[in-house]
């Protein structure tokens, strides 16, 4: 039994890091493998993560972590019974994938303005709370070409757009994702999308 693709890990910088790897053949990850991990400076016995299958030869493990700080470094040992298959380390702050924003809501009752709001996925005491910026994707269900991205580079989790920038009388969907420049993170997954019917009063034309 050998590791074909070494474990790579990403952290949500809060409580979970996810490690994925591939074996050289079909493997029952949960019965055959164990990923041991420990925060180096604690000098205590490692914790055990039981991996799950992720495709025939792929495995994934969700490492439970505590609050993360930038200096944290974890040791990782991948075992098959008594055989050490791979040894490595992981610094969560260097491999951050933020949590997806939640509770995306479209408020349509504000005088021809669309107000989109969502929730920051981190608690205020987490470092990323004040460092997230967002991308909002709005698209038409009727017209695949009507697809737009709005970059929200301020901290407030909201976006205002004029309803008239979208077509009237049709349905739109929106979703939002986050990233943090400070840690050069990857983008989060998209939030669940939300749907609304866009309608606004055309301005009265005077002749």
């Amino acid at each position: 039994m050998k590791v074909l693709q070494e474990p790579t890990c990403v952290s949500d910088y809060m409580s979970i890091s996810t490690c994925e790897w591939k074996m050289n053949g079909p493997t029952n990850c949960s019965t055959e493998l164990r990923l041991l991990y420990q925060l180096v400076f604690l000098l205590s016995e490692a914790h055990t993560c039981i991996p799950e299958n992720n495709g025939g030869a792929g495995c994934v493990c969700h490492l439970l972590m505590d609050d993360v700080v930038s200096a944290d470094n974890y040791t990782l040992d991948l075992w098959a019974g008594q055989q050490l298959l791979w040894k490595g380390s992981f610094k969560p702050s260097e491999h951050v994938k933020p949590r997806a924003p939640g509770n995306l809501t479209v408020h349509t009752n504000v005088s021809d303005t669309l107000l989109l709001t969502w929730s920051n996925p981190y608690p205020p005491d987490n470092y990323l709370y004040n460092h997230l910026t967002y991308a909002v994707n709005i698209w038409s269900e009727n017209d695949p070409a009507d697809f737009r991205i709005y970059n929200v580079t301020y901290l407030e989790p909201s976006l205002r757009i004029a309803a008239s920038t979208l077509k009237s009388g049709i349905s739109y969907r929106a979703r939002v994702r986050a990233w943090a420049q400070c840690y050069n993170t990857t983008w989060s997954e998209w939030s669940p999308s939300t749907k609304w019917h866009n309608s606004y009063r055309e301005p009265f034309e005077q002749h």
Epitope: F41, L43, S44, E45, D66, V69, A71
Partner: antibody
């Protein structure tokens, strides 16, 4: 419940040696790093040394490096501090403390043993 | 080494007073901070761990807050048993470090 009981303190002359022990119970001793912390009379708390769960890694405060040795016997659930070349400034109450397996854990300390270095 | 700066070093207060002690870390330690109470001749007693978690059996008038580099211990209403010395401690490295202590005295 977690219990840590220090022993081995006493009065010793400068330059002499002393060995402190810490008997642990109520938890899986072999899973935890263990620390020594001291407090000179009327002063604050000072970290002294730590040993990893399996004894493979040891770290010391600069003030005791080269003179003190931390060790453990996991079969006896006991932590030790061998103190050589003792100085007057080593006079303190010495506490053993359990480390953490997660930074969300609770820290436990013993009641301490007094070491007096005096001629 | 992570340096912990605690203030004030001493404090006089009256029964029923609200008291706040602060602790500043020289670098980000997340929430890896504990607060202890110590009385003469006794071992330090853990009050707060993980910056804001109240240790079992500790009265709810004690509370901790903060994360990163700035932390506070608050006693909402001083009781006779609270006059003691208080220490903060970081455990964000294998070498623990402590604040210098705050001696809380009766006014």
């Amino acid at each position: 419940q977690v219990q840590l009981v220090e022993s081995g303190g006493g009065v010793v002359q400068p330059g002499r040696s002393l060995r402190l022990s810490c008997a642990a119970s109520g938890f899986t001793f072999s899973s935890y790093a263990m620390h020594w912390v001291r407090q000179a009379p009327g002063k604050g708390l000072e970290w002294v040394a730590v040993i990893s769960y399996d004894g493979s890694n040891k770290y010391y405060a600069d003030s005791v490096k080269g003179r003190f040795t931390i060790s453990r016997d996991n079969s006896k659930n006991t932590l030790y501090l061998q103190m050589n070349s003792l100085r007057a400034e080593d006079t303190a109450v010495y506490y053993c403390a359990r480390g953490l397996t997660t930074v969300r854990g609770v820290l436990y300390w013993g009641q301490g043993t007094l070491v007096t270095v005096s001629s | 080494e992570i340096v912990m700066t605690q203030s004030p070093s001493s404090l006089s207060a009256s029964l029923g007073d609200r008291v706040t002690i602060t602790c500043r870390a020289s670098q980000n330690i997340g929430s890896r901070l504990a607060w202890y109470q110590q009385k003469p001749g006794k071992a330090p007693k853990l009050l707060i761990y993980k910056a804001s978690s109240l240790e079992s059996g500790v009265p709810s008038r004690f509370s901790g807050s903060g994360s990163g580099t700035e932390f506070t211990l608050t006693i909402s209403s001083l009781q006779p048993d609270d006059f003691a010395t208080y220490y903060c401690q970081q455990y964000n490295s294998y070498s623990w470090t402590f604040g210098q202590g705050t001696k809380l005295e009766i006014k």
